[in-house]
Amino acid sequence: WELTILHTNDVHSRLEQTSEDSSKCVNASRCMGGVARLFTKVQQIRRAEPNVLLLDAGDQYQGTIWFTVYKGAEVAHFMNALRYDAMALGNHEFDNGVEGLIEPLLKEAKFPILSANIKAKGPLASQISGLYLPYKVLPVGDEVVGIVGYTSKETPFLSNPGTNLVFEDEITALQPEVDKLKTLNVNKIIALGHSGFEMDKLIAQKVRGVDVVVGGHSNTFLYTGNPPSKEVPAGKYPFIVTSDDGRKVPVVQAYAFGKYLGYLKIEFDERGNVISSHGNPILLNSSIPEDPSIKADINKWRIKLDNYSTQELGKTIVYLDGSSQSCRFRECNMGNLICDAMINNNLRHTDEMFWNHVSMCILNGGGIRSPIDERNNGTITWENLAAVLPFGGTFDLVQLKGSTLKKAFEHSVHRYGQSTGEFLQVGGIHVVYDLSRKPGDRVVKLDVLCTKCRVPSYDPLKMDEVYKVILPNFLANGGDGFQMIKDELLRHDSGDQDINVVSTYISKMKVIYPAVEGRIKFS
């Protein structure tokens, strides 16, 4: 019996087609992805093959103005239109709190939404009961297939699930649910979830009875043969893991942003054992036409976005200096504003010992692309912020050793004075440079804001200590020459859309007046 698994993950509200780098589509003839194009390919496969499942491994939420405006209603609507068969909850599905998951998505999806390792307690337990499930048995042709869901247990640090959801260890939570499926004589079981490629592989190895793992969170690109675009494969597709009980378990993921449609063919014997598995992600490029009816629907929904982008989010009573002349040479108040917004967006009081789990922000000055003049009645719009942060990036959470941070700050000024983008703006950090010293030895003081303290204060950076830092995904990926961050980071979790973080902060503050206050000094 043959099953075709089509899968997406980490789509991050890319409902419209995008450029090759998953930013806003500029030249339509070279654009990729989007739900209209995805629908064309899915329907083509559904017509050609008998047993097809379309699955999503989480993080549909967050990433473009679509999510900012529609808050998840767009996810339910277009996933329903594409007739997804199941979805696992990702960490970003909790970005607007549990209510922001329940109302627009859990109540509106016409397909099951899954997670076995999220347990509700207190008053939420009855409210959310039945709206998401640990597993689902799906009819496929004349057979049934079990799907068991899982979500990163780091979600309380990455999003806003509140205090009434407990995120358990994935493997511990999955095993009894898989066992339950086995007692129901379901012998073909897919683990669908959002904990990253390393956990996907562990699940394949450790959870008895799981036949296939379809993952997300780490934006992992797997491919067999010559890759069709810029993404470099982390391994073959499918990635085969040998389980502790000796089975060959295929593990797949399909990069991110709806650029690819994962395509995996699995052959099962009559006892539900995997005989063979093969496939590859399908690049959704312009050779695949956009479905006209879905495209028309997208255009209808788009109207509200255009209206939103010119509405006032808040006011500034000071000039927001985002000029290259400032932000690439010294502390600029636009950099301070953005870093303060980044920290504010990551406030999670999850431990009595810590006022917050993260206090530090770094931001490449070259990523700040425009100032905002206060003389336009002080008005700040989404459109204004899109000029400041035009690249459609995310502000991510990483863990780094102090020694890596020190290298990053040395890199920040290694060729100071040439208006290069690597000069770092900061939050929760006080840095002093001495430019008379040779490159690589110019940081003379680097103090960081404590987290395990009731009264935050600045202490000298410790080289061997592990710190959490919020930074743009561009830096996490080694951009602007910050190779040491990419090479030495100990953990990396994708965060919220950059403009969304700043716009939310401005809306919350209502009136802003960021200052230059001595975060960056020269001796």
Epitope: A109, L138, P139
Partner: nanobody
Framework: ALQLVESGGGLVQPGGSLRLSCEVS????????IGWFRQAPGKEREGVSC????????YYADSVKGRFTISRDNAKNTVYLQMNSLKPEDTGVYYC?????????????????WGQGTEVTVSS
């Protein structure tokens, strides 16, 4: 919370008719496939009929084809099972069940939400 409540069961003579109702609360009916199942004393639960979320597709077990009709009134959040030409072998507890998805099924394993059941006895 999601709830399904069956009603309309009772004692009926062979050849007679009954109309079972299943009222759902806590969710929007048109997002769910609905199935009717029955369990005769000492037997396995068996699928009788099911209706897709849109109501566009309906399926019946061979044993009831031509005699039973499933219908739904999404506005009233209620699903009905019209049972005609009843036979003694139709006796049992009738359950209505629901699940989200695109493909209606008579396989009990795919249903996530169940009612408490209503008893039907066909006897002279």
């Amino acid at each position: 919370a999601l709830q399904l409540v069956e009603s309309g069961g009772g004692l009926v003579q062979p050849g007679g008719s009954l109309r079972l109702s299943c009222e759902v609360s806590g969710f929007t009916l048109d997002y769910y496939n609905i199935g009717w199942f029955r369990q005769a004393p000492g037997k396995e639960r068996e699928g009788v009929s099911c209706s897709s979320n849109s109501g566009g597709s309906t399926y019946y077990a061979d044993s009831v084809k031509g005699r039973f009709t499933i219908s739904r009134d999404n506005a009233k959040n209620t699903v009905y099972l019209q049972m005609n030409s009843l036979k003694p072998e139709d006796t049992g507890v009738y359950y209505c069940a629901a699940y989200r998805g695109w493909h209606p099924s008579l396989d009990a394993r795919v249903y996530d939400y169940w009612g408490q059941g209503t008893e039907v006895t066909v006897s002279s």
